[in-house]
Interface confidence: medium
């Protein structure tokens, strides 16, 4: 039914062996539940366990590589431990009645055996050279070839649990983590925003004067316009930073590169999986060769949408790492229906996770020079920030939106509230920005007083 892993891909039956069939039939009735056993074990000093039939006796646990054959007969007497048989192991001191079965590397997943199973260590499986692990569950991974980044450059090299991150050359876009020629880009696809429109040859009567002069006039005109634009942008950034420091309290900008500095060609937002080290959910993002995902939501033309009316589209799906499956022990989520913005000052203001307007309001009202500090405080790593910048290289706001969307997806619903953002902004001395965000979303009349939000 609700299996913690895919059938036929079951992990070593550690839980099963702990919970059923471990004890001989004569002892089963006397063994307390696991929780009770833990409580009772704590009565004995470390390295000892309580005798299942006589709780005044503490027996010595068995060393790794062995299992419990018979409990100690009395205080100070040895526990009868036997070595694990071939094909089984125990990796730590224990009082298990059976050793654990050795794992087998899964050939259909491309896995190879790094080291064989021994009495005190399970089989170690891995991937071949120039391959990476794509995790489907905590212990189940599939091996894929690292991308070579043909027609592009390696932005982040292939790692044990992460594919290469490619940056495509001009005239190419990223699809399935491969750089594909823009000539293969159809209008309906996501690549349209990455492939600049090709200037079509205008057929007409050949006028030698026009053919020479017109391109020159256009060229110089464009140069002037771009210089003007750069100048305006520079002044705008300075003005915006100054304004923020006035409006949003004590703003001491970080001396670090802003997101605008990213000039590399962005990765196509690609919602397939990518590996994640260990069991910590990190949401950096890299595609997997097996499949590419495309959003059914249509992209609004232009690199940066109009923020007055943000498009009804969530940031690129799964801007994040692979599915690391929590095992059957993973805690079940606390049911928490989505709360809309409400006028009540007594309820925590929960972000409407399906409404981009909320996230865009945050993007618009946090000073650009403090942005990286802000998302770091929300828990994003530098690696994730860099990757999201790269993926949205042409548009600062979209990169920032993606970072917030990543935070929102990783944070339990109950915690993804304006209250949490408020705490972070308050810690950054940017309380004024929080008020701006609230005002942008609700209008001054609908808002509860700010202090009640941040209590």
């Amino acid at each position: 039914m609700g299996l913690s892993t895919v059938p036929d891909l079951l992990l070593p039956l550690v839980l099963l062996e702990l919970l059923v069939g471990i004890y001989p039939s004569g002892v089963i009735g006397l063994v307390p539940h696991l929780g009770d056993r833990e409580k009772r074990d704590s009565v004995c000093p470390q390295g000892k366990y309580i005798h299942p039939q006589n709780n005044s006796i503490c027996c010595t646990k068995c060393h790794k590589g062995t299992y419990l054959y018979n409990d100690c007969p009395g205080p100070g007497q040895d526990t009868d431990c036997r070595e694990c048989e071939s094909g089984s192991f125990t990796a730590s001191e224990n009082h298990l009645r059976h050793c654990l079965s050795c794992s087998k590397c899964r050939k259909e997943m491309g896995q190879v055996e790094i080291s064989s199973c021994t009495v005190d260590r399970d089989t170690v499986c891995g991937c071949r050279k120039n391959q990476y692990r794509h995790y489907w569950s905590e212990n189940l991974f599939q091996c894929f070839n690292c991308s070579l980044c043909l027609n592009g450059t390696v932005h982040l090299s292939c790692q044990e649990k992460q594919n290469t991150v490619c940056t495509c050359h001009a005239g190419f876009f990223l699809r399935e983590n491969e750089c594909v020629s823009c000539s293969n880009c159809k209008k309906s696809l996501e690549c349209t925003k990455l492939c600049l429109p090709q200037i079509e040859n205008v057929k007409g009567t050949e006028d030698s004067g026009t053919t020479v002069l017109l391109p020159l006039v256009i060229f110089f005109g464009l140069c002037l316009l771009s210089l003007l634009f750069i100048g305006l942008m520079y002044r705008y950034q300075r003005w915006k930073s100054k304004l923020y420091s006035i409006v949003c309290g004590k703003s001491t900008p970080e001396k670090e590169g802003e997101l605008e500095g990213t000039t590399t060609k962005p990765l196509a937002p690609n919602p397939s999986f990518s590996p994640t080290p260990g069991f910590t959910p990190t949401l950096g993002f890299s595609p997997v060769p097996s499949s590419t995902f495309t959003s059914s939501s249509t992209y609004t033309p232009g690199d940066c949408p109009n923020f007055a009316a943000p498009r009804r589209e969530v940031a690129p799906p799964y801007q994040g790492a692979d599915p690391i499956l929590a095992t059957a022990l993973a805690s079940d989520p606390i049911p928490n229906p989505l709360q809309k913005w409400e006028d009540s000052a007594h309820k925590p203001q929960s972000l409407d996770t399906d409404d981009p307007a909320t996230l865009y309001a945050v993007v618009e009202n946090v000073p650009p020079l403090r942005w990286k500090e802000f998302v770091r405080r929300l828990g994003l790593s530098d690696h994730e920030i860099d990757r999201l910048e790269l993926q949205n290289g042409r548009c600062l706001r979209e990169a920032q939106y993606s970072m917030l969307a990543t935070w929102r997806r990783r944070t339990p619903r109950r915690e993804a509230t304006l209250e949490l953002l408020g705490r972070v902004l308050r810690d950054m001395d940017l309380l004024g920005c929080l008020e701006d965000i609230e005002e942008a979303l609700c209008g001054p009349a609908a808002l509860p007083p700010a202090p009640s939000l941040l209590r």
Partner: nanobody, 120 residues
Framework: EVQLLESGGGLVQPGGSLRLSCAAS????????MAWVRQAPGKGLEWVSR????????YYADSVKGRFTISRDNSKNTLYLQMNSLRAEDTAVYYC?????????????WGQGTLVTVSS
Amino acid sequence: EVQLLESGGGLVQPGGSLRLSCAASGFTFADYQMAWVRQAPGKGLEWVSRIDRGGFHTYYADSVKGRFTISRDNSKNTLYLQMNSLRAEDTAVYYCAKPSWHADQYFDYWGQGTLVTVSS
């Protein structure tokens, strides 16, 4: 207890259609994005499709784009996969998967799977 129960699989001819269902229980269905993942015989796992909590946004693998449609009915706690223009390479066990609480893209529960066989 979280339970995901797939149904609707079976034998179908190339070009035919099937609709898979996944009945969910034991958690607040509307709070989670949901996904379909498949495993062809003797092969690794492959992503098929994903849908957001409200059913507004859907995402597909290139291999199924334009042929498969994912949908959900939050009032019935059910996830669907409408499969049209089926091909032999779509033969696989299809799993319905629920993300864990800490991030939408890490799965902690899968159904038992339903076998789809496309053959003439």
